[in-house]
């Protein structure tokens, strides 16, 4: 049997059965995530699952820039360290960076200290790149 | 109620470095706002110089990009405004102002300061 | 020359409707939200419509706005002689490294 290979959107990467964009636009938190689902084909600021898939974003975007952090689907809507990824995935794989989680910062990305392979939490109302996910 | 209040020489010479600087009353610059300059040369419409955010990140008009530092000041209460090898064309009325975010999308200026005129002449 | 296009002038007798337009293009109001300000004579430049069609407090309801595509708009509505002003409209822009853009301004003459 043939298996066709499902298509992302224009300007989009596909990995392992997701579809993956880089928007290199100014976005707080919220407005990225907004940005995300008005894509269609439900969208969200992106959630990262294991080492092989962090790896694989780190690569592609380290083909772009190599120094703007960039917004991630993981949050702490509570305030209270309580992480969760906004598409309901399990909140497995951790990456954080040794940094301070404390202060007003409940939202993650994706630092650009270690090539975008670890995390930082984040004021949410700061503007930054964002980068959305779906399953096609 | 938060209010703006910017200060600075207001005569710079031609090639020489406007600096400014916007005190914040009522309010924080460590809250969840970035803090903005806009100029106007006189008779002329807005021109957006650039925005600081309290930890230090900053936005800059690509066209003065190469010009502009902002830098901010917790302790005080206050952020700064520097714009390099300035020349007439930078002639113009120096607003600072907080933008908000709004909880249905996107930015605004809500809160500004009276406003600086800073002339370039030698 | 402003990123975003709005005539020079508009104006109308008291109690009119007066409309301003404001285009842009798809990197700005195409996808990012429109703030209008109004500038009185000698004073700084105060916020009066926010993402498209929210009004702040104290910003009477005569004033509307409204955005589809890549174009705005401000309507007054029962003009009045103190909206005699210059009316900017604004949008974030996403192009090169993101920047906040201004339109060019309308003078707004209450004949």
């Known amino acids: 049997d043939i298996i066709m290979r499902p298509s992302c959107a224009p300007g989009w990467f596909y990995h392992k059965s997701n579809c993956y964009g880089y928007f290199r636009k100014l976005r707080n938190w919220s407005d990225a995530e907004l940005e995300c689902q008005s894509y269609g084909n439900g969208a969200h600021l992106a959630s990262i699952l294991s080492l092989k898939e962090a790896s694989t974003i780190a690569e592609y975007i380290s083909g772009y820039q190599r120094s703007q952090p960039i917004w991630i689907g993981l949050h702490d809507p509570q305030k209270r360290q309580q992480w969760q990824w906004i598409d309901g995935a399990m909140y497995l794989y951790r990456s954080w960076s040794g940094k301070s989680m404390g202060g007003n910062k409940h939202c993650a990305e994706m630092s650009s200290n270690n090539n975008f392979l670890t995390w930082s939490s984040n004021e949410c109302n700061k503007r930054q790149h964002f980068l959305c996910k779906y399953r096609p | 109620q938060v209010q703006l209040q910017e200060s600075g020489p207001g005569l710079v010479k031609p090639s020489g470095t406007l600096s400014l600087t916007c005190a914040v009353s009522g309010g924080s610059i460590s809250s969840s706002n970035y803090w903005s300059w806009v100029r106007q040369p006189p008779g002329k419409g807005l021109e957006w110089i650039g925005e600081i955010y309290h930890d230090g990140s900053t936005n800059y008009n690509p066209s003065l990009k190469s010009r502009v530092t902002m830098s901010a000041d917790k302790s005080k209460n206050q952020f700064s405004l520097k714009l390099s090898s300035v020349t007439a064309a930078d002639t113009a009325v120096y607003y600072c102002?907080?933008?908000?975010?709004?909880?249905?999308?996107?930015?605004?200026?809500?809160?500004w300061g009276r406003g600086t005129l800073v002339t370039v002449s030698s | 020359q402003s990123v975003l296009t709005q005539p020079p002038s508009a104006s109308g007798t008291p109690g009119q409707r007066v409309t301003i337009s404001c285009s842009g293009s798809?990197?700005?109001?195409?996808?990012?939200?429109v703030n209008w300000y109004q500038q009185l004579p000698g004073t700084a430049p105060k916020l009066l419509i926010f993402?498209?069609?929210q009004r702040p407090s104290g910003v009477p309801d005569r004033f509307s706005g409204s955005k589809s595509g890549t174009s705005a708009s401000l309507a007054i509505s029962g003009l009045q002689s103190e909206d005699e002003a210059v009316y900017y409209c604004?949008?974030?822009?996403?192009?090169?490294?993101?920047?906040?853009?201004f339109g060019a301004g309308t003078k707004v003459t209450v004949l």
């Open positions: 798809s990197s700005n109001i195409g996808s990012n939200t």
């Open positions: 993402s498209n069609n």
């Open positions: 102002a907080r933008d908000s975010p709004s909880y249905s999308s996107g930015w605004y200026s809500d809160y």
């Open positions: 604004a949008a974030w822009d996403d192009s090169l490294t993101g920047f906040y853009v």
